[in-house]
């Protein structure tokens, strides 16, 4: 069984977050991936997402963020640049599987920026700030708007939950139930 | 100590497998993803994936697909690489090696602790 | 695959000496690069992370700069067990891969 968590990563303004989010290769190398955020009580919302089908090592750009999958990995790289209070939140990645619903990824990432300079993250103090070029090769994809009630309608609660679940993805229509479970510190 | 503990030296002949094993202690393995290099003699360190030891996910670099499988006992903190249809440019030591990162998602794909390596010759 | 090209492959210099090795990407990695140490018979060690953080533990004089597709890493005083091979690795693209390695000697 493995652990519904949520990161908590504090960045300052200026620094670029850049995580992974791994997924089971065999089921969806190809598929439609797409980085959401989850505001207080609204529907999570799709800020950017791959081609469909996926393809890869193959950058896609959406204003600030930078999506990229690796198929023969399992990996979808995000990178959010140049990073402003207001990105302050709960994000996800997800997988688009239509007709089904969506499947959510973990972890999920809540962001704090802050006002001021630092190193990025899990650097020392006098480390240089990540600054990321944009590759001149991105493109832009449409990503489909899953507006089905049953998806989640409440953002799940701003510390860890230890929630077991078989695999490594959980499909968004059990998130009401998991969001339930009382949460662990 | 913090440590990963890898099975003795091996000899096979082109055709076979071999399964590689690397014992996590000192830390909770389900916590750091491991990945596994190998290195030819005389020659330099060659990636060959990943392994999520928490939900078993993997990866593979493209020339081992199909020939690599990781696979892990959460149960005694225990990583494997087996490596099939092996052929003499196989003959490598091989490392498991545990990837740090601040944050368990983050990119960041620093190998900060190494198994001490396992031989594996193939020779008919 | 993101080639790595390091020089040089090998060196030899003296104790005291400020010693550079050069790795090159062959496209934009940013900052993602690693710089390992490997003795005979024993597995590589982390020295510099994220091109220029020094790990834990790791001796001041060693250090990395460089971003994009320059990279350098330098010894700033030789010692007699710094005699070792050193990588360089990166982490921009997937997936990846190594320098060739640098041998260090002693004159």
């Known amino acids: 069984a493995t652990k519904l968590t949520e990161e908590k990563y504090e960045l300052k303004e200026g620094q670029t977050l850049d995580v992974k989010c791994d997924y089971t290769l065999e089921k969806f190398a190809s598929s439609q991936k797409a980085w959401q955020i989850i505001r207080d009580g609204e529907m999570p919302k799709t800020l950017a997402c791959t081609e469909r089908p996926s393809k890869n090592s193959h950058p896609v750009q959406v204003g600030r963020i930078i999506l990229e999958d690796y198929h023969d990995h399992g990996l979808l790289r995000v990178r959010m640049v140049n990073l402003q209070v207001e990105d302050s939140g709960l994000y996800q990645c997800v997988i688009y599987q239509p007709p089904k619903e969506p499947h959510m990824l973990f972890d999920r990432i809540r962001l704090v920026v802050t006002k001021g300079f630092s190193g990025t993250p899990g650097s020392n103090e006098n480390s240089t700030q990540n600054v990321y070029k944009i590759p001149p090769t991105t493109t832009k994809a449409l990503c489909p708007l899953y507006t089905s009630p049953r998806t989640v309608t409440q953002a799940p609660p701003k510390s860890t939950a230890d929630v077991s679940t078989p695999d490594s993805e959980i499909n968004l229509t059990n998130v009401t139930d998991i969001i339930r479970v009382p949460v662990f510190n | 100590q913090v440590q990963l503990v890898q099975s003795g030296a091996e000899v096979k002949k082109p055709g076979a497998s071999v399964k590689v094993s690397c014992k996590a202690s000192g830390y909770t393995f389900t916590s750091y993803d491991i990945n596994w290099v190998r290195q030819a003699t005389g020659q330099g360190l060659e990636w060959m994936g990943w392994m999520n030891p928490n939900r078993g996910n993997t990866g593979y670099v493209k020339k081992f697909q199909g020939r690599v499988t990781m696979t892990r006992d959460t149960s005694i903190s225990t990583a494997y690489m087996e490596l099939s249809s092996l052929r003499s440019e196989d003959t490598a030591v091989y490392y498991c090696?545990?990837?740090?990162?601040?944050?368990?998602?983050?990119?960041?794909?620093?190998?900060?602790?190494w198994g001490r390596g396992t031989l594996v010759t193939v020779s008919s | 695959d993101t080639q790595m090209t390091q020089s040089p492959s090998s060196l030899s210099a003296s104790v005291g000496d400020r010693v550079t090795i050069t790795c090159q990407a062959s496209q934009d990695i940013f900052n993602d690069l690693n710089w390992y140490q490997e003795k005979p018979g024993k597995a590589p060690k982390l020295l510099i992370y994220h091109a220029s953080n020094l790990e834990t533990g790791v001796p001041s004089r060693f250090s990395g700069s460089g971003s994009g597709t320059d990279f350098t890493f330098t010894i700033s005083s030789l010692q007699p067990e710094d005699i070792a091979t050193y990588y360089c690795?990166?982490?921009?693209?997937?997936?990846?891969?190594f320098g060739g390695g640098t041998k260090v000697e002693i004159k």
């Open positions: 690795q990166q982490y921009g693209n997937l997936p990846l891969t």
């Open positions: 090696a545990r990837r740090r990162a601040v944050y368990r998602s983050s990119w960041e794909w620093y190998f900060d602790l």
